[in-house]
Interface confidence: medium
């Protein structure tokens, strides 16, 4: 079957890294500089991605694979194949149209990306606030007052954020 297909379409013999050159009697020609073909049998080579501006080259383009980009320090990738770079903020901030802004009271962000999220409302789980929240950290919920008997002092991890909690000042 392969032999039959090859007789019908000589381009099927062209391996990755080459293209089937119609201008040269369908000879397999190497991809020109700054281009690639990742599969065999291609009639053209694709232009290599250029990582410029805030994009850095993570992997150079080769004749058989495209370049891969990541983002310069201070930025992080978004989208499939790092199609965009978004600037980092500090912990305790979120990115807005006006750049990085501090989290509002009652919210936190413990990462350099993403949005500020409400503190856990410990009372929803019948617990009390053991450690107050900050712009960078969620509150830590402790046992409910009723649970505070001798020997019962384990701290439960914060529950998923549901609505703004209130941190006693």
């Amino acid at each position: 079957f392969e032999r039959t297909r090859s007789l019908q379409d000589p381009c099927s013999n062209c391996p990755a890294g080459t293209f089937c050159d119609n201008n040269r009697n369908q000879i397999c020609s190497p991809c020109p500089p700054n281009s690639f073909s990742s599969a065999g049998g291609q009639r053209t080579c694709d232009i290599c991605r250029q990582c410029k501006g805030v994009f850095r080259t993570r992997k150079e383009c080769s004749s058989t694979s495209n370049a891969e980009c990541d983002c310069t320090p201070g930025f992080h990738c978004l989208g499939a194949g790092c199609s965009m770079c978004e600037q980092d903020c500090k912990q305790g901030q979120e990115l807005t149209k006006k750049g990085c802004k501090d989290c509002c009271f009652g919210t936190f962000n413990d990462q350099k990306r993403g949005i500020c999220r409400p503190w856990t409302n410990c009372s929803l789980d019948g617990k009390s606030v053991l450690v107050n929240g900050t712009k960078e950290r969620d509150v830590v919920c402790g046992p409910s007052p009723a649970d505070l008997s001798p020997g019962a002092s384990s701290v439960t991890p914060p529950a998923p954020a549901r609505e703004p909690g209130h941190s006693p000042q």
């Epitope: 501006g53 978004l78 989208g79 965009m84 978004e86 600037q87 149209k97």
Partner: nanobody, 123 residues
Framework: EVQLVESGGGLVQPGGSLRLSCAAS????????MTWFRQAPGGGLEWVAN????????YYVDSVEGRFTVSRDNAKNSLDLQMNSLRAEDTAVYYC????????????????WGQGTTVTVSS
């Protein structure tokens, strides 16, 4: 090909002015937020200013507020940055970038960048 090309950089004395331009091609310019960044020698990239699709919203980093003005001409596919009262600390390579607004729940990704134009403020 989607492209951004900056121009207008140069050497200027403290207190002087420069106007940077960014020519866009290969995409529908009026559909995108646009942003200016800069990179001082030996430093990281710093967001400077951005402008929404029709030019009605403009935002600036605190250090340039009142001195720099971002504008755009959608008919000419151009983005400008008017820089007045320049200071030594404004010395940097300035880049324009296309904003990738509308990507998922994160709205501030940049997907196309120019090659940069150098501004040197020195006496």
């Amino acid at each position: 090909e989607v492209q951004l090309v900056e121009s207008g950089g140069g050497l200027v004395q403290p207190g002087g002015s420069l106007r940077l331009s960014c020519a866009a091609s290969g995409f529908t310019f009026s559909n995108y937020w646009m942003t200016w960044f800069r990179q001082a020698p030996g430093g990281g990239l710093e967001w400077v200013a951005n402008i929404n699709q029709d030019g009605s919203e403009k935002y600036y980093v605190d250090s340039v507020e009142g001195r720099f003005t971002v504008s755009r001409d959608n008919a000419k596919n151009s983005l400008d940055l008017q820089m007045n009262s320049l200071r030594a600390e404004d010395t940097a390579v300035y880049y324009c970038a296309r904003g990738g607004l509308g990507y998922g729940d994160s709205h501030y990704g940049m997907d196309v960048w120019g090659q940069g134009t150098t501004v040197t403020v020195s006496s």
